[in-house]
Interface confidence: low
């Protein structure tokens, strides 16, 4: 039975040219996290494997940095970065947990961080 929950940074916004930290946190489970995938719609951004460490997709390696923790930092943001991002936790024995973050990249200086929220 999957008892865990994923808390994410929720709906967030940032300025064009800036950077943003995407974070998820898995709680309420004793399952072992074997790997975390970060995906943007259908594209793989990065993988953090418990044994092998981080792998950043070559097409993103100049704009993506690992961390903090199992999170991901996106740099040099463009309006095209607007969209859904997913943290996919592969765990044993529970299986897969997925968290969703929506990022809006704004042209002006009106960007504000959204509230954190939980995805059951």
């Amino acid at each position: 039975m999957m008892t865990g929950t994923i808390e994410t940074t929720g709906n967030i916004s940032a300025e064009k040219g800036g950077s943003i930290i995407l974070q998820c946190h898995l709680s309420s489970t004793t399952a072992q996290v074997t790997q975390v995938n970060w995906e943007q719609q259908d594209q793989l951004l990065a993988i953090c494997n418990a044994d092998l460490g981080w792998h950043i997709s070559p097409s993103f390696k100049d704009r993506v940095a690992p961390g903090p923790g199992l999170g991901l930092t996106l740099q040099s943001l463009t309006v095209n970065d607007t969209g859904e991002y997913f943290c996919i936790y592969h765990t044993y024995p529970d299986g897969t947990y997925t968290g969703r973050i929506f990022l809006e990249v704004l042209e002006s200086s009106v960007a504000e961080h959204g509230a954190r929220f939980q995805i059951p």
Epitope: L52, G53, W54, K61, P66, G67, P68, G69
Partner: nanobody, 111 residues
Framework: EVQLVESGGGLVQPGGSLRLSCAAS????????MGWFRQAPGKEREWVAS???????WYADSVKGRFTISADNSKNTAYLQMNSLKPEDTAVYYC?????WGQGTLVTVSS
């Protein structure tokens, strides 16, 4: 118990240099990456630089060309060499490794 201890902060004049160290202890494994973040008064914590165990490095645009991150894997220690410091680099600098945080070290750039 995992501990991250930062050191090397202090007061420096604009254009000067500092080298920060972050010693990680208590790990049962070598962290796959270590990073530096900073938080200026009244501002959010921001990422500065990260280094993978294999040596690959990333930098925030604001420090690129001035700061250099490195790691000694055998000592589980990360370093941040900061050159050409500016007043806007003034902040508490934090080390992060495998989701553990240090207490921070204060860097003040002022004449």
């Amino acid at each position: 118990e995992v501990q991250l201890v930062e050191s090397g902060g202090g007061l420096v004049q604009p254009g000067g240099s500092l080298r920060l160290s972050c010693a990680a202890s208590g790990f049962t494994f070598s962290p796959s990456w270590m990073g530096w973040f900073r938080q200026a008064p009244g501002k959010e914590r921001e990422w500065v630089a990260s280094v993978l165990r294999g040596g690959y490095t990333w930098y925030a645009d604001s420090v690129k060309g001035r700061f250099t991150i490195s790691a000694d894997n055998s000592k589980n220690t990360a370093y941040l060499q900061m050159n050409s410091l500016k007043p806007e680099d003034t902040a508490v600098y934090y080390c992060d490794a495998a989701d553990y945080w240090g207490q921070g070290t204060l860097v003040t750039v002022s004449s």
